[in-house]
């Protein structure tokens, strides 16, 4: 194929691939008609002047995962047709000025996973057609003003996984076409007001895993097209009341792993496209009325692992589409009987790992479609008569690890549980805590007359049997976080997000048999 170097493979489609540790320099002669050239996993340490001079038709050039640490300014001369250039995963510390001069057709430039210490305005001043610039995974500590001023057509800019401590409010001002901006995993402590004002077409903004403590009230007010906003794993302690007010297109918002102490009413919205909101691992202590009232399409709300001790009766007003509510691992002692009244479509609720001492008899009164209720590891001694009677779809109920008081008052609950045993699961059953003579015995099979011989047990109407199915629970298992290493380690550069590091397999979703769409 017009002379293919022995250390390369050349296809009929003008594609050349050169790989292997034995390669220490750009192979020659390269086929003059090559349109795609990949040089991967070699021991090439430098690119000298014009090694690609005779392949001027080249459209894509990937020089990745090599030992490349030095490039001569004229290395890419005569590649005027080049649209895609990747130098990712090398050992570049410095980019020579003028390196990309003459690459008038260049649309994608990947410089990620190198050791770049700085970039300058002159580096990209010739790249007026650039649409994508990947700089993540380098050692950049600051971005000088003007660095991107000539990249007016840029749609995707990734600066994640660097060492940026601050951002100038002017650095992105000319990027009116930018759709994706990623700044995750840096050391940013604050974002100056106006930083994103010029980004009127921005659709995704990734700021997760920084050290941001405060958000300016109008930080996102010009970003009306923003669809995905990642703010998780920062140090945000409060949200200015209007910070999310101008984001009507938002369909993903992550705020978990911050230091939020409170949420003001109406803080979210209007966000008619937001279907999931993850707020776990914050310091939220209470939920006021109407705090989520603008989120009328929300389907999943995760509030687990906070310090919530009080939920106002109208806190969940407006959440008419909510399907899953996770409140586990908080500090709840009591719940108002009306707190879930508006959640007519709720299917899964996790309340485990709280301090609930009792539940109002009407707590689930309007939530007729509930399929899974997690109440394990609370301070419950009994439950009100008929609390689950109307829940014909209930197929999973977790009640273990509560200090059940097995006196005569427990009989109605015991009888109902006896008739609905499959819903309790097979892993752990609820056991008596008191009186002492029955401690540790199964609540389901305990003989209440033996437990309290001195008390006359009156005829008490038992909980009616509700339908269950031989194969229940017939809904999918929810194991929130696998403990496998690939899930608990941080996500690599190009996935652009980070998994949380936890090993407790119920720690986030907190539902073990809950149904899922």
């Amino acid at each position: 194929y017009h002379g293919c170097p022995s250390e390369c493979t050349c296809s009929r489609a003008s594609q050349v691939e050169c790989t292997g540790a034995r390669i220490v320099a750009v192979p020659t002669p390269l086929p003059w008609n090559a349109m795609s050239l990949q040089i991967l996993n070699t021991h090439i340490t430098e690119l000298n002047e014009s090694p690609f001079l005779n392949i001027s038709a080249l459209i894509a050039l990937r020089i990745e995962k090599n030992e490349l640490s030095r490039i001569t300014p004229g290395a890419f001369r005569n590649l005027g047709s080049l649209r895609y250039l990747s130098l990712a995963n090398n050992k570049l510390q410095v980019l020579p000025i003028g390196l990309f001069q003459g690459l008038d057709s260049l649309e994608s430039l990947l410089l990620s996973s190198n050791q770049l210490l700085q970039i300058q305005p002159a580096h990209f001043s010739q790249c007026s057609n650039l649409k994508e610039l990947q700089l993540h995974g380098n050692h950049l500590e600051y971005i000088p003003d003007g660095a991107f001023d000539h990249l007016v057509g840029l749609t995707k800019l990734n600066l994640g996984k660097n060492s940026l401590t601050h951002i100038s409010p002017r650095v992105f001002q000319h990027l009116g076409n930018l759709q994706v901006l990623r700044l995750y995993e840096n050391r940013l402590t604050d974002i100056p007001m106006g930083t994103f004002d010029g980004l009127v077409n921005l659709q995704e903004l990734a700021l997760q895993q920084n050290q941001i403590g405060l958000l300016s009230p109008g930080l996102f007010h010009n970003n009306h097209n923003l669809q995905r906003l990642y703010l998780s794993n920062n140090h945000i302690s409060q949200l200015p009341p209007s910070v999310f007010m101008q984001l009507p297109q938002l369909n993903r918002l992550t705020l978990f792993g911050n230091s939020l102490k409170e949420l003001s009413p109406g803080i979210f919205g209007p966000m008619p496209n937001l279907r999931e909101l993850w707020l776990y691992d914050n310091h939220i202590s209470s939920l006021p009325d109407n705090v989520f009232s603008n989120l009328r399409q929300l389907q999943v709300l995760i509030l687990s692992r906070n310090q919530i001790s009080f939920i106002s009766p109208g806190a969940f007003n407006g959440l008419t589409e909510l399907r899953e509510l996770s409140l586990h691992t908080n500090a709840l002692q009591d719940l108002d009987g009306n707190v879930f009244r508006m959640l007519a479509n709720l299917q899964n609720i996790s309340l485990q790992n709280n301090r609930l001492r009792q539940l109002p008899g009407n707590i689930f009164a309007n939530v007729n479609g509930l399929m899974a209720i997690q109440l394990q590891n609370n301070q419950l001694e009994n439950l009100p008569l008929g609390i689950f009677d109307h829940l014909g779809k209930l197929c999973e109920l977790r009640l273990y690890d509560n200090p059940w008081r097995c006196d005569s008052d427990i009989l109605p609950l015991r009888n109902w549980l006896l008739l609905n045993q499959p819903r309790l699961g097979t892993d752990t059953v609820p056991v008596c805590f008191s009186p002492a003579n029955v401690r540790g015995q199964s609540l389901i099979i305990i003989n209440v007359n033996v437990a309290v011989p001195s008390v006359h047990v009156p005829e008490v109407p038992s909980y009616p049997e509700t339908p269950w199915y031989p194969d229940t629970p017939s809904y999918p298992d929810t194991t929130s976080v696998s403990s496998t290493t690939e899930l608990t380690s941080p996500v690599e550069d190009y996935t652009d997000l980070t998994t949380i590091q936890v090993t407790d397999d119920r720690s986030v979703w907190g539902m073990t048999q809950a149904q899922s769409g």
């Epitope: 995905r228 369909n251 993903r252 279907r275 999931e276 009328r296 399409q297 389907q299 999943v300 008419t320 589409e321 399907r323 899953e324 007519a344 479509n345 299917q347 399929m371 017939s474 809904y475 999918p476 298992d477 929810t478 194991t479 929130s480 976080v481 696998s482 496998t484 899930l487 608990t488 996500v491 996935t495 652009d496 997000l497 980070t498 998994t499 949380i500 986030v508 979703w509 149904q515 899922s516 769409g517």
Partner: antibody, heavy 119, light 110 residues
Framework: EVQLVQSGAEVKKPGSSVKVSCKAS????????IHWVKQAPGQGLEWIGL????????NYNQKFKGKATLTVDTSTTTAYMEMSSLRSEDTAVYYC????????????WGQGTTVTVSS | DIVLTQSPDSLAVSLGERATINCRAS??????????MAWYQQKPGQPPKLLIK???SLESGVPDRFSGSGSGTDFTLTISSLQAEDVAVYYC????????FGGGTKVEIK
């Protein structure tokens, strides 16, 4: 361009296991749910379960609990489905698919992996 | 599980004519705002392709001759003017509870 590329066809003996991979590209892998769907020869579609790479969370159809295990490797943006104790009725095409939110429809699908169980 | 029953099993329609496929759920899959119903098209040897989500929302890139309607338990996929490339099997799917699919409707040209 959003792509889900699945591993090649497999022929397995009854009682053995198979692990099908689904390599994602063109989107932020951890930001979407990955579903798995079974289609037996000449049959309709059957939902196996989902995995959410963001936290590693899984949901299973009770029918496939104990049969299928869903995992992800976020470093390679790849989802896996392992099927154990294979029987002839596990012969099918298995698809991975992407969903934006947990209850959303599946907007992109892999090309499918044919698993044949035969002695 | 929610059972989805599609009708008819197969359908032969002339080019340019209207094709209508029905899907009935064994219980409601709708709220006041949304119906958790989707429609897919599958051609031989290919994976399913999403056409309609949330009962009536046309997926990006899908020709507007496809439309979806219905709520509660009864849903319809309509192809307003059948084209040769529309020959396929069509499936409905609900995500209200554990996801289930209809048995499929084969659309052919008369």
């Amino acid at each position: 361009e959003v792509q889900l590329v699945q591993s090649g066809a497999e022929v397995k003996k009854p009682g053995s296991s198979v692990k099908v991979s689904c390599k994602a590209s063109g989107f932020t892998f951890t930001d979407y749910y990955i579903h798995w769907v079974k289609q037996a020869p000449g049959q309709g579609l059957e939902w196996i379960g989902l995995v959410y790479p963001y936290i590693g969370g899984t949901n299973y159809n009770q029918k496939f609990k104990g049969k299928a295990t869903l995992t992800v490797d976020t470093s390679t943006t790849t989802a896996y489905m392992e099927m154990s104790s294979l029987r002839s009725e596990d012969t099918a095409v298995y698809y991975c698919a992407r969903g934006d939110n947990k209850y959303d429809a599946m907007d992109y699908w892999g090309q499918g992996t044919t698993v044949t169980v035969s002695s | 599980d929610i059972v989805l029953t599609q009708s008819p099993d197969s359908l032969a329609v002339s080019l340019g004519e209207r094709a209508t496929i029905n899907c009935r759920a064994s219980q409601s899959v709708s709220t006041s705002s949304y119906s958790y119903m989707a429609w897919y098209q599958q051609k031989p040897g290919q994976p399913p392709k999403l056409l309609i989500k949330y009962a009536s929302s046309l997926e990006s890139g899908v020709p507007d001759r496809f439309s979806g309607s219905g709520s509660g338990t009864d849903f319809t996929l309509t192809i307003s003017s059948l084209q040769a490339e529309d020959v396929a099997v069509y499936y409905c799917e609900q995500s209200w509870e554990i996801r289930t699919f209809g048995g499929g409707t084969k659309v052919e040209i008369k």
